[in-house]
């Protein structure tokens, strides 16, 4: 039932732009006067009962253009993809030649999106058609969830519980706000 199943328009990967580009630092914006005080959603730590660093979930970056029908984003965009299996961080193969994958005995854990964010995208269209403005859904961060017998998104169970949180919101990663940098995200990568 997750949004990944929603229709996703074609995208093209641009490897020559760098495999893991860093988003630009956040610029000043004029929204602060309406912001909730302490309005950021606190970071999600699904393993709070243990050492937070004990488990890891890989986040990969890709650069690509986003399309909507015949229209294509004016600039390539950078997106985050949750990848791989969850396990103790010390055993995840983050470097070439590093050992084997950790496989839990018992329930299976999967790296899936935790939070989402929006990015403005201006789409240029052929044939003199007017440009389009859209906001694309991006993965902001990943987390580990436990797979139950049923493997659809809605059945993924959290590691631990989350209490009520005041003022929804979190700046998941710095990004240019007023520059309106365009970003998009991969479907079915999880």
């Amino acid at each position: 039932q997750g949004w990944q199943a929603f229709k996703n328009d074609a995208t093209e990967i641009i490897p020559e732009l760098g495999e893991y580009p860093e988003p630009p630092p956040e610029l000043e914006n004029n929204k602060t006067m309406n912001r909730a005080e302490n309005g950021g959603r606190p970071p999600h730590h699904p393993f709070e009962t243990k050492d937070v660093s004990e488990y890891s979930c890989r986040e990969l970056h890709f650069t690509r253009y986003v399309t909507d029908g015949p229209c294509r984003s004016a600039k390539p965009v950078t997106e985050l993809v949750c990848s791989g299996q969850c396990g103790p961080a010390r055993l995840l193969p983050n470097a070439i030649g590093r050992g084997k994958w950790w496989r839990p005995s018992g329930p299976d854990f999967r790296c899936i999106p935790d939070r989402y964010r929006a990015q403005r995208v201006q789409l240029l269209c052929p044939g003199g058609e007017a440009p389009r403005a859209r906001k694309v859904r991006l993965v902001a961060s990943c987390k580990c969830k436990r797979l139950t017998r049923f493997h659809n998104q809605s059945e993924l169970k959290d590691f631990g519980t989350e209490a009520a949180r005041p003022q929804k919101g979190r700046k998941p990663r710095p990004r240019a706000r007023s520059a309106k940098a365009n970003q998009a995200e991969l479907e079915n990568a999880y």
Partner: antibody, heavy 121, light 110 residues
């Protein structure tokens, strides 16, 4: 599909506070951007505030700044809107609305049934 | 805070065409205001017809279309039906802060 179910009607006295809930089903709250809109009897729609996924923050309409608090409980997928220092002109139907959790953000796609809040002494 | 203006009321004949507009006190409405259009009938919650200037939804009848027209957002109804009689609201995005227009009461004379 996203579905929103709101709490029942409330009658409050001036100066009191009201907390309206909005239960999300079909998706998890963390996948969605919840906004709150109100409509006084015979009047138009008025945006109160909501989650801006572009900046990852809750943003409130200036008119309600300091008087409204929007929170969430992700363990129950329920969003809340609390309005304090109520006055008679706050009598309205309060709606929660959310995006469709699609590839493109489209806000206000799904609406709760509305909660009538009556402020009367 | 910006003020969003709409025609208070408009009338159209069945089968006719009518255009509702949505202006901003801050200047011309552009695609970067991501204009939305909503339809609301008495006793019902609003429902979205158009998002992001011109993007229809699965439930939006084909006779509705969104555009920009002379510095305003526009909702055009071509081939009006009796069931289109309703209140129509536009909504503009001012960098994450939203403002509704005052609404247009559309009457379908029949």
């Amino acid at each position: 599909e996203v579905q929103l179910v709101q709490s029942g009607a409330e009658v409050k006295k001036p100066g009191a506070s009201v907390k309206v809930s909005c239960k999300v089903s079909g998706y998890t709250l963390s996948e969605l951007s919840i906004h709150w809109v109100r409509q006084a009897p015979g009047k138009g729609l008025e945006w109160m505030g909501g989650f801006d996924p572009e900046d990852g923050e809750t943003i409130y309409a200036q008119k309600f700044q300091g008087r409204v608090t929007m929170t969430e409980d992700t363990s129950t997928d329920t969003a809340y809107m609390e309005l304090s220092s109520l006055r008679s002109e706050d009598t309205a139907v309060y709606y929660c609305a959310t995006d469709s959790a699609g590839y493109w953000y489209k806000f206000f796609q799904h609406w709760g049934q509305g909660t009538l809040v009556t402020v009367s002494s | 805070q910006a003020v969003v203006t709409q025609e208070p009321s408009l009338t159209v004949s069945p089968g006719g065409t009518v255009t509702l507009t949505c202006g901003s006190s801050t200047g011309a409405v552009t695609i970067d205001h991501y204009p939305y259009w909503f339809q609301q009938k008495p006793g019902q919650a609003p429902r979205t017809l158009i998002s992001d200037t011109d993007d229809k939804h699965s439930w939006t009848p084909a006779r509705f279309s969104g555009s920009l027209l002379g510095g305003k957002a526009a909702l055009t109804l071509s081939g009006a039906q009796p069931e289109d009689e309703a209140e129509y609201y536009c909504l503009l995005d001012y960098g994450g802060s939203f403002v509704f227009g005052g609404g247009t009461k559309l009457t379908v004379l029949g």
